[in-house]
Amino acid sequence: DHHHHHHEQKLISEEDLRADPCAARPCAHGGRCYAHFSGLVCACAPGYMGARCEFPVHPDGASALPAAPPGLRPGDPQRYL
């Protein structure tokens, strides 16, 4: 009973994921994935936030467009960078 994760026309086995947890590309919106001793870390692209970089940042004034501060920002700036 061999489990596979389908991603971009590629089959990724459970063994592959154990060896490289970032293989499944878990970070959203162009976030960079890093394998950290305590688990995965997503460093978010400008204008995104969240553990998976799943949320667009909304500035005050509630524009529907995400803000774009310079540089990559981790999902958790306090813990990881």
Partner: antibody
Framework: QVQLVQSGAEVKKPGASVKVSCKAS????????MHWVRQAPGPGLEWMGI????????SYAQKFLGRVTIARDTSTSTVFLDLYSLRSEDTAVYFC??????????????WGQGTLVTVSS | EIVLTQSPGTLSLSPGERATLSCRAS???????LVWYQQKPGQAPRPLIY???TRASGIPDRFSGSGSGADFTLTISRLEPEDFALYYC?????????FGQGTTLEIK
Amino acid sequence: QVQLVQSGAEVKKPGASVKVSCKASGNTFTNYYMHWVRQAPGPGLEWMGIIDPSVGSKSYAQKFLGRVTIARDTSTSTVFLDLYSLRSEDTAVYFCARAGKRFGESYFDYWGQGTLVTVSS
Amino acid sequence: EIVLTQSPGTLSLSPGERATLSCRASQSVSSNFLVWYQQKPGQAPRPLIYGASTRASGIPDRFSGSGSGADFTLTISRLEPEDFALYYCQQYGDSPYTFGQGTTLEIK
């Protein structure tokens, strides 16, 4: 232990605004995300938005854009929800909820007790 | 947005019986980031299972979660009187976070 204590019930008229607060204790405020979720009469939960207290970044559900603001005061470990242009459909219990920042742990592990907001003319 | 559909809407069982609650997503849930909550009247929801199958702190082992992709199940192996409540699933993989409409577990 972790506690999220919310402000008291509010009664508002249509078109008015409401501010709900949520004070966190028993944890490092900036190490967690804070969310707002509402529950209208009867079952049904609706996510409204998130704030990262460490940097103040926030994101809102599309349906609330332009009508909601989430803010935080790190000196008192408090987050705030402001909802504007209230209508009768906004009558609900509003919850704050804490979520982990670690990958895979961003579910709502602690919730406030809820704040009933009633919108009625 | 991801729509979560829970079934059944109401489940009528007796203490000691086994309960099986279903949560189906309109598309695959990223990284199986799905959580089950229990809610009792006048209270906030409390997490039971997160990551589809990991028990939250302090949750008895009669509660278990399974499933992946778009199909998830919460099982209560032997119902206790305090288990009769409202149960919600929620995905926390993609924005906006969304909830199922709930399953009411009532005493038969």
